[in-house]
Interface confidence: medium
């Protein structure tokens, strides 16, 4: 005969645990209903009855099932100079993340309190490093043989173009310009870029019985331009 | 306008608890910090701590790390700082603040105060 | 922790005057061109104020008489023309890291 289905709230077996989604109850003693996320617990269960879930308020939410007493708060509005890649709703938390070319400069457990821009190297310096969520660009000098003639926070240093006859050499800053022949090789046109950081999204633990991957919204500031490292600007 | 009140005036033996509490008005409570500093007589400024309402994170100053609990009642819009095992050198006047999660990372908006005296 | 230090403890100012206050930091409160640096007004019997914040920011409501100026390290509140109710003790603090730490209070009185 098949094992009769237990309804909750019910007894568990010695040494057994409760089924998906469903927590053991201290007060009772017994399995019963976690909420479903965007819900929390209106009341919980007795041994008689299950637990009571109610939706979420506004400008809050829950990630996973659970029974928390109350709705986690959303994190913070963002700021002007933010973006908003993820909206409050009843089942995730606001993300605010940097706009582009900005990164995290000074971050808590709730995000990211500053946003700065990013460095950008001056010509003559290329990105060595770039920006990540958390750290910004790093600027070196253009070896010998290649040269950046931008300003940017993405633009590393790129061969000189090798010419049958040099009209004027390269330096640092400039490519090389070969005279009317065309040179023997070349990089394609254009600046080669590197990728733009993702902006920060902290890791925040939801108080739930059981892990949570919930981001928390990141907190930005606008802030002014980074003061001009070597071989960088902060314009 | 943004108005921080807190409780009135407390005075404890020494080894009891005190639990003084912030009643925010005028802004977003949860979108904002609580900061908690005192100030002992004719004495400087001591941040205690500070406590994120959205999500009841906390941060303690070391020194008080053990004695102080900082928590929020979201619903009333209201901030406590219990602060346990009490000694004379805790006789101080306790304030809240409002800080700015973005913008200033100041405290802005200042409670008025409570005097805590800690005498046998 | 950041250790800040205010100098002179106190100051006597004629009316009209300027007065400058000036704080230091164990370690730069910098953090990508921005010093988390800020300036606080306290009269007796009150919760301090905020004058100054980041520096050199001008709080609302502030009189334009009170500046804020430094980085890295090396601070100044400076009252260009000390008038009566400016007699105060005021405040340094740092919010880059935790534990925030205030300076010990520098008290101006009239001269």
């Known amino acids: 005969l098949p094992a009769q289905v237990a309804f909750t709230p019910y007894a568990p077996e010695p040494g057994s645990t409760c089924r998906l989604r469903e927590y053991y109850d201290q007060t009772a003693q017994m399995c019963c209903s976690k909420c479903s996320p965007g819900q929390h617990a209106k009341v919980f269960c007795t041994k008689t009855s299950d637990t009571v879930c109610d939706s979420c308020e506004d400008s809050t939410y829950t990630q996973l099932w659970n029974w928390v007493p109350e709705c986690l708060s959303c994190g913070s509005r963002c700021s002007s100079d933010q973006v908003e890649t993820q909206a409050c709703t009843r089942e995730q938390n606001r993300i605010c993340t940097c706009r582009p070319g900005w990164y995290c400069a000074l971050s808590k457990q709730e995000g990211c309190r500053l946003c700065a821009p990013l460095r950008k190297c001056r010509p003559g310096f290329g990105v060595a490093r770039p920006g990540t969520e958390t750290s910004d660009v790093v600027c070196k000098p253009c070896a010998p043989g290649t040269f950046s003639n931008t300003t940017s926070s993405t633009d590393i240093c790129r061969p000189h173009q090798i010419c049958n006859v040099v009209a004027i050499p390269g330096n640092a800053s400039m490519d090389a310009v070969c005279t009317s022949t065309s040179p023997t090789r070349s990089m394609a046109p254009g600046a080669v870029h590197l990728p733009q950081p993702v902006s920060t999204r902290s890791q925040h633990t939801q108080p739930t019985p059981e892990p949570s991957t919930a981001p928390s919204t990141s907190f930005l500031l606008p802030m002014g331009p980074s003061p001009p490292a070597e071989g960088s600007t902060g314009d | 306008q943004v108005q921080l009140v807190q409780s009135g005036a407390e005075v404890k033996k020494p080894g009891a608890s005190v639990k003084v509490s912030c009643k925010a008005s005028?802004?977003?409570?949860?979108?904002?910090?609580i900061d908690w500093v005192r100030q002992a007589t004719g004495q400087g400024l001591e941040w205690m701590g500070e406590?994120?309402?959205?999500?009841?994170?906390?941060y303690y100053n070391e020194k008080f790390k053990g004695r102080v609990t900082m928590t929020r009642n979201k619903s009333i819009s209201t901030a406590y700082m219990e602060l346990s095992s009490l000694r004379s050198e805790d006789t101080a006047v306790y304030y809240c603040a409002r800080s700015q999660v973005y913008g200033k990372i100041a405290m802005d908006h200042w409670g008025q105060g409570t005097l805590v005296t800690v005498s046998s | 922790d950041i250790v800040m230090t205010q100098s002179p403890d106190s100051l006597a100012v004629s009316l009209g005057e300027r007065a400058t206050i000036n704080c230091r930091a164990s370690e730069s409160v910098d953090n990508s061109g921005n010093s988390f640096m800020h300036w606080y007004q306290q009269k007796p019997g009150q919760p301090p104020k905020l004058l100054i914040y980041r520096a050199s920011n001008l709080e609302s409501g502030v009189p334009d008489r009170f500046s804020g100026s430094g980085s890295g390290t090396d601070f100044t509140l400076t009252i260009s023309s000390l008038q009566a109710e400016d007699v105060a003790v005021y405040y340094c603090?740092?919010?880059?890291?935790?534990?925030?730490?205030f300076g010990q209070g520098t008290k101006v009185e009239i001269k």
């Open positions: 603090q740092q919010s880059k890291e935790d534990p925030y730490t």
């Open positions: 406590i994120y309402p959205g999500s009841g994170n906390t």
């Open positions: 005028g802004y977003t409570f949860t979108d904002d910090y």
